[in-house]
């Protein structure tokens, strides 16, 4: 571990209550495919716990979505990916629309410092699907 | 080599007889900029030869396409990588349907084990690109 | 340095002129979040120091776009990576329509050369957006 | 086995219509697209349209003012209908199944034909 | 529209020797890596037959005789050795874009 390879890949958990457009996260081997090894949950949202450049990348996939009813919605579902506290360091890291599709799915590089919580947050009524090879959140420490 | 840095990128052989959803693979220099260093091949499955966790990556474009003409064809056209073998192991690892595109991409990580076998099956009529800079398939390890 | 982890996360600058499809980008903690340790940017265009394998990924989204505006255009908006000198070596290596999409995100290995410049092409005539989080282009080394 | 039978007249009157209807068996049309194809010794094959699974259609921009492709999947059956004919449309009138994959247009199995004479 | 040009219009050849036929596209054919470029066969009252798909893909049941090969916008059907039962009209007909068309056909005779 000490040699900061630093690596989480979560699941969906639920969604948060109706003002709360954040994305709630879970992970760990008795869960399925999902693991947290170095960074931490805190109440559903990542935190990281060592300072570096990482790897995030995320895939949402909306629940029984056809590509009409994502259309069929007035206001645009969106993703964004940021970091939400410390509010000192809130930036949006990675935003995706769906439009007329019914997955996003996008990575980038980034540096993150120790503390830094990510939130993914899901603006409009759908619901995404828990499926885990459908939606998925993770980060990976890449070097210093 | 010792390092355990397993890496593949691999671009699209074939696709297989019609009731064979999986895609096929190959890789070599010989080939383009496709290559295998540490997984091997079988019958152009992808084989894992080192346990760890693996970022998957997959980028599959359909021929010929419209962002119409996907929506035209009755059966959404899918396309899921998993673990095919061992069967004990079977599994979805990532998942997502084309609705009225015609390219998806994606990527996560994921634990896998020396023997896993991955396959991609792609669900519905229509035939892939075999461009390679539309249609790839690669594995990278990144930790024990 | 040394360990050869050259890594680099772009954001855009500014479009090129009209007959010219290319994307041109910057990079430097002064802008945000983006960063070049290791490779280069020669006229906004990314050059590559060090040889080996690369993790190249890129997000592009559209400025002010519906997915009904995309597919209002006659030719087809699409971003294509590739290396585009030294000539003896220029390839496509990564190719996205956006059909009724708004955002293109999509990643790759390949190997890269020292002195390799990757040129990101935009064909079509819509205005990518500028935005951090919607529009970024990386490379991240992951083995020699 | 595979097999589509048409069924139609042989002989229509100038300016009028023509209605073809394709039986189709071994197969389901939710799965195949269909095309219609004609034949003549003046102007050989000529592609006229087809019917996709989802039943959407694409028409050869030649005919499209006059031609009329629908279906009835429970019964297996496509309709074929094209109107204002005149003396060069003198042909046989073929109805063929797209190959499997939906994306590449060609077609494996064709229906015996319908020999259609536009005549007073 | 893709105009298809076939050569020769028609051709005698021996029982067990090459038959070559050719089929020219106005514009390029190829997409995807792959050529949108299928050949028919057909024989007197009867529906034309599918020969080969995608350029050199054999349909099923077709004699591995018959061989196609091409990209771009030239093509090729070659049948070796002919059979007396080959004696029919062999079409080209693309598919790298609506309309589809087909070429005028090539006779082939056996002597």
């Known amino acids: 571990e000490s040699l900061g390879w630093d690596i989480a890949e979560l699941q969906l958990n639920h969604t948060g209550p109706q003002q709360d457009p954040r994305l709630y996260w879970q992970g760990g081997p008795a869960l399925g495919r999902s693991f947290l090894r170095g960074p931490e949950l805190d109440k559903g949202q990542l935190r990281i716990r060592r300072d570096g450049i990482y790897m995030v990348h995320i895939q949402v996939t909306l629940a029984i979505c056809s590509s009409t009813s994502t259309s069929r919605h007035h206001h645009p579902t969106t993703l964004a990916v940021g970091i939400c506290s410390p509010a000192s360091r809130s930036i949006s890291l990675l935003r995706l629309s769906f439009h007329q599709g019914c997955t996003i799915a996008s990575q980038r590089l980034t540096p993150l410092a120790r503390g830094d919580t990510l939130c993914t947050n899901l603006t409009g009524t759908l619901l995404p699907s828990r499926n885990t090879d459908e939606t998925f959140f993770g980060v990976q420490w890449v070097r210093p | 080599e010792s390092l355990g840095w397993d890496i593949a990128e691999l671009q699209l052989n074939h696709t297989g007889p019609q009731q064979d959803p999986r895609l096929y693979w190959q890789g070599g220099p010989a080939l383009g900029r496709s290559f295998l260093r540490g997984p091997e091949l079988d019958k152009g499955q992808l084989r894992i030869r080192r346990d760890g966790i693996y970022m998957v990556h997959i980028q599959v474009t359909l021929a010929i396409c419209s962002s119409t003409s996907t929506s035209r064809h009755h059966h959404p056209t899918t396309l899921a990588v998993g673990i095919c073998s061992p069967a004990s192991r079977s599994i979805s690892l990532l998942r997502l349907s084309f609705h009225q595109g015609c390219t998806i991409a994606s990527q996560r990580l994921t634990p896998l084990a020396r023997g896993d076998t991955l396959c991609t099956n792609l669900t519905g009529t229509l035939l892939p690109s075999r461009n390679t800079d539309e249609t790839f398939f690669g594995v990278q390890w990144v930790r024990p | 340095e040394s360990l050869g982890w050259d890594i680099a996360e772009l954001q855009l600058n500014h479009t090129g002129p009209q007959q010219d499809p290319r994307l041109y980008w910057q990079g430097g903690p002064a802008l945000g979040r983006s960063f070049l340790r290791g490779p280069e940017l020669d006229k906004g265009q990314l050059r590559i120091r060090r040889d080996g394998i690369y993790m190249v990924h890129i997000q592009v989204t559209l400025a002010i776009c519906s997915s009904t505006s995309t597919s209002r255009h006659h030719h087809p908006t699409t971003l294509a990576v590739g290396i585009c000198s030294p000539a003896s070596r220029s390839i496509s290596l990564l190719r996205l329509s956006f059909h009724q999409g708004c955002t293109i995100a999509s990643q790759r290995l390949t190997p890269l050369a020292r002195g390799d410049t990757l040129c990101t092409n935009l064909t079509g005539t819509l205005l990518p957006s500028r935005n951090t989080d919607e529009t970024f282009f990386g490379v991240q080394w992951v083995r020699p | 086995q595979v097999q589509l039978q048409q069924s139609g007249p042989g002989l229509v009157q100038p300016s009028q219509s023509l209605s073809i209807t394709c039986t189709v068996s071994?197969?389901?049309?939710?799965?195949?697209?269909v095309h219609w194809v004609r034949q003549s010794p003046g102007k050989g094959l000529e592609w006229l349209g087809v019917?996709?699974?989802?039943?959407?259609?694409d028409y050869n921009a030649a005919f499209i003012s006059r031609l009329s492709i629908s279906k009835d999947n429970s019964k297996s059956q496509v309709f074929f209908k094209m109107n204002s004919l005149q003396a060069d449309d003198t042909a046989i009138y073929y109805c063929?199944?797209?190959?499997?994959?939906?994306?590449?247009?060609?077609?494996?199995?064709w229906g015996q034909g319908t020999s259609v004479t536009v005549s007073s | 529209d893709i105009v298809l040009t076939q050569s020769p219009a028609s051709l005698a050849v021996s029982l067990g020797q090459r038959a070559t036929i050719s089929c020219r596209a106005s514009?390029?054919?190829?997409?995807?890596?792959?050529?949108?470029m299928h050949w028919y066969q057909q024989k007197a009252g009867q529906p034309p037959k599918l020969l080969i798909y995608?350029?050199?893909n054999l349909e099923s049941g077709v004699p591995a005789r018959f061989s196609g090969r091409g990209s771009g916008t030239d093509f090729t059907l070659n049948i070796h050795p002919v059979e007396e039962g080959d004696a029919a009209t062999y079409y080209c007909?693309?598919?790298?874009?609506?309309?589809?068309?087909f070429g005028a056909g090539t006779k082939l005779e056996i002597k």
């Open positions: 007909q693309h598919s790298r874009e609506l309309p589809l068309t």
């Open positions: 063929a199944r797209n190959i499997y994959y939906g994306n590449v247009y060609a077609m494996d199995y």
């Open positions: 514009k390029s054919v190829d997409a995807s890596g792959y050529s949108f």
């Open positions: 071994g197969f389901s049309l939710t799965t195949y697209a």
């Open positions: 019917i996709w699974s989802v039943g959407s259609t």
């Open positions: 995608l350029a050199s």
